[in-house]
Interface confidence: medium
């Protein structure tokens, strides 16, 4: 089978997923197709021990997450739950909950310099990092 | 309501110039980044140029690369396109249209007709 | 450079599906963007990365994209959907459009 057994070179493995930290800036779109391009996706943050390990990793820099709401409602990039999902707004944020057009045209999230996220205007050139998962049930062991 | 209305467009001898407006109302302007497409009679879409939302970084169609330059006013809510050394391919509707964030065209405006001919 | 293929024309039957593809290497690992013309009239947006709906756009639309192929789907054809559509990715700094597909309602 093609399953992921061990993360590629230069990621790092945390609770069955890789997880791989840019050094450079993007806008959120050439951010999200870079990890396609790695058959990954941009960071999705489930829970207050995910988030805790993606922010030691970033440090205190703006960074996209795989949140957006181009279309109105936040939708993670992976398809997870956002309404009943884990979330970690800065207070006051996000700011242009409803609109395309409307308000501040802010419609991609990231991690800000505490950690907590905001909603931001999509083409700014910010870190990113993308996720992908370890296959749960591998038919493979892993090469030696 | 969000709305973008250009001008700019007509008759024109090839190798002359012609500069494209674009009027944005509706939205905060500055807070997208913005593209040109043109469609030629009876033809499909073809994308000529995007400029970031704050004019730091510019793209280009290679058919227009070194004659066409895209531009914007933000504290005018306006976007160009300068048009040089026009040929007579480059006949065509031309829309301007915003961003979305994923390089998808969200809103386009009515387009506005050049025509390059001797 | 990245190219797009789609169908010149694909029919559909009044209240039958219709599908329209757009082929390109890789594709799956792209965002593909999916717009429909009526003549005379400029283009409007109604897929957005892959599968995504903007406000205003039926669900009768939908999109799916893996491996070489993008497709846009039209259930339940209605007069009103007679029109070109264009498929629409992002590639090294240039925007790639489909040469577009002309839907015709029977």
């Known amino acids: 089978g093609s399953e992921r057994t061990c993360c590629p070179v230069n990621w790092v493995e945390h609770e069955r997923s890789c997880y791989w930290f840019s050094r450079s800036g993007k806008a959120w779109a050439d951010a999200d197709n870079y990890c396609r391009l790695e058959d990954a996706h941009l960071v999705v943050v489930t829970s207050w021990e995910e988030q805790k390990f993606v922010q030691h990793h970033i440090g205190p820099v703006n960074t996209w997450m795989g949140l957006h709401d181009q279309n109105g409602p936040w939708k993670w990039v992976d398809g997870t739950d956002y309404e009943t999902g884990f979330k970690n707004w800065r207070p006051e944020q996000p700011d242009d909950w409803y609109g395309h057009g409307l308000g501040g045209g802010e419609d991609c999230a990231h991690f800000t310099d505490d950690g907590r996220w905001n909603d931001d205007v999509c083409q700014r050139p910010y870190r990113w990092v993308c996720e992908t998962e370890l296959d749960k049930a591998s038919q493979e062991p892993p090469l030696l | 309501q969000v709305q973008l209305v250009e001008s700019g467009g007509g008759v024109v001898q090839p190798g002359r110039s012609l500069r494209l407006s674009c009027a944005a109302s509706?939205?905060?302007?500055?807070?997208?980044?913005m593209h040109w497409v043109r469609q030629a009679p009876g033809k499909g879409l073809e994308w000529v140029a995007i400029i970031w939302f704050d004019g730091s970084n510019e793209y280009y169609a290679d058919s227009v690369k070194g004659r066409f330059t895209i531009s914007r006013d933000n504290s005018m809510s306006t976007l160009y396109l300068q048009m040089n050394s026009l040929r007579a391919e480059d006949t065509a509707v031309y829309y301007c249209?915003?961003?979305?964030?994923?390089?998808?065209?969200?809103?386009w405006g009515q387009g506005t007709m050049v025509t390059v001919s001797s | 450079s990245y190219e797009l293929t789609q169908p010149l024309s694909v029919s559909a039957a009044l209240g039958q599906t219709a599908r329209i593809t757009c082929g390109g290497n890789?594709?799956?690992?792209?965002?593909v963007h999916w717009y429909q013309q009526k003549p005379g009239q400029s283009p409007v947006l109604i897929i957005h990365r892959d599968s995504d709906r903007p406000s205003g756009i039926p669900e009768r639309f939908s999109g799916s994209n893996s491996g070489n192929t993008a497709t846009l789907t039209i259930s339940r054809a209605q007069a009103g959907d007679e029109a070109d559509y264009y498929c629409?990715?992002?590639?090294?700094?240039?925007?790639?459009f489909g040469g577009g597909t002309k839907l015709p309602v029977l």
């Open positions: 629409q990715v992002w590639d090294s700094g240039t925007a790639v």
């Open positions: 249209a915003r961003e979305s964030g994923s390089y998808a065209l969200y809103i």
């Open positions: 890789n594709i799956g690992r792209k965002n």
């Open positions: 509706g939205f905060t302007f500055s807070n997208y980044g």
